[in-house]
């Protein structure tokens, strides 16, 4: 079976404060089994933005129906963007494990820049 790739096609996205940001992510394989999570930043200080299995994550909506078994699109929309949302966002695949899922592979990241609303 094909090795899983995580594709974040946009290196950067510019969004005006108050608007909605779309962060794109697709995967190329359904294996290994396990959830997708989105993070802002990397390393131990990263912020969890979206977890396919838990929530709710009130400002986040998925572009596709991620509950469908063969879904490979894990793009998200984040509403009501503020300057504090700026940063690099990573789409990360986890492998199902016990008791905890294990991080398997990360996308290259999409840098979100926030343009201040003109006052």
């Amino acid at each position: 079976e094909e090795e899983l790739q995580i594709i974040q096609p946009d290196k950067s996205v510019l969004v005006a404060a108050g608007e909605t940001a779309t962060l794109r992510c697709t995967i190329t394989s359904l294996f290994p089994v396990g959830p997708i999570q989105w993070f802002r930043g990397a390393g131990p200080g990263r912020e969890l933005i979206y977890n396919q299995r838990e929530g709710p994550f009130p400002r986040v909506t998925t572009v596709s129906d991620t509950t469908k078994r063969n879904n490979m699109d894990f793009s998200i929309r984040i509403g009501a963007i503020t300057p504090a949302d700026a940063g690099t966002y990573y789409c990360v695949k986890f492998r199902k494990g016990s008791p905890d899922d294990v991080e398997f592979k990360s996308g290259a990241g999409t840098e979100l820049s926030v343009r201040a609303k003109p006052s």
């Epitope: 802002r40 131990p44 200080g45 838990e54 994550f57 009501a80 006052s119």
Partner: antibody, heavy 119, light 108 residues
Framework: DVQLVESGGGVVRPGESLRLSCAAS????????MNWVRQAPGEGLEWVSR????????DYAESVKGRFTISRDNSENTLYLQMNSLRAEDTAVYYC????????????WGLGALVTVSS | ETVLTQSPATLSVSPGERATLSCRAS??????LAWHQQKPGQAPRLLIY???RRATGIPDRFSGSGSGTDFTLTISSLQTEDSAVYYC??????????FGGGTKVEIK
Amino acid sequence: DVQLVESGGGVVRPGESLRLSCAASGFSFSSYAMNWVRQAPGEGLEWVSRINSGGGGTDYAESVKGRFTISRDNSENTLYLQMNSLRAEDTAVYYCAKQYDWNGFFDYWGLGALVTVSS
Amino acid sequence: ETVLTQSPATLSVSPGERATLSCRASQTVGSKLAWHQQKPGQAPRLLIYDASRRATGIPDRFSGSGSGTDFTLTISSLQTEDSAVYYCQQYYYWPPYRFGGGTKVEIK
């Protein structure tokens, strides 16, 4: 129902240490950033510290930086605040507060734990 | 840092009357402003977020409005149980998270 219950408050002398705990239930604790907010007698609310969902990212108010340490145990659904080198001006009720999302307001508050620093 | 200024410091209103509380930010916070209610001897409770959205279980006599730098919390028909201190909180720029100094609502 979301519940946040603080414990560990008490009376200490200046320069001593104390550790507060906050037991969380009713939500997916590991998915949310958590905060400590304090209120000195007869005063308003002062944000003290924040920790991200995974525990690797922390922020502190200038007034406590270098003296207080926030941490969490996601397996035990518990938030902590280690307070060292306590001063009289740290006397307050300390509330733990759940964050609505990674960049948001505080949607649930604990009942508070009273810390009194007095010689 | 964004400073939040609440006015008036104290507001005395008769039951059934309207109470209007103000919160002004030193720089724009968009619509990222919340209101919390704290009754004597109790923990704060979220009332309003995103300037105008009522939190779960909050009666509709509480409403919020405003954007940018000027915000208002209105209690349309004051009840005796609304006697409390009300704090605004911004979450547009952080850290630190900032609260206003509070407005104490008293029943006449």
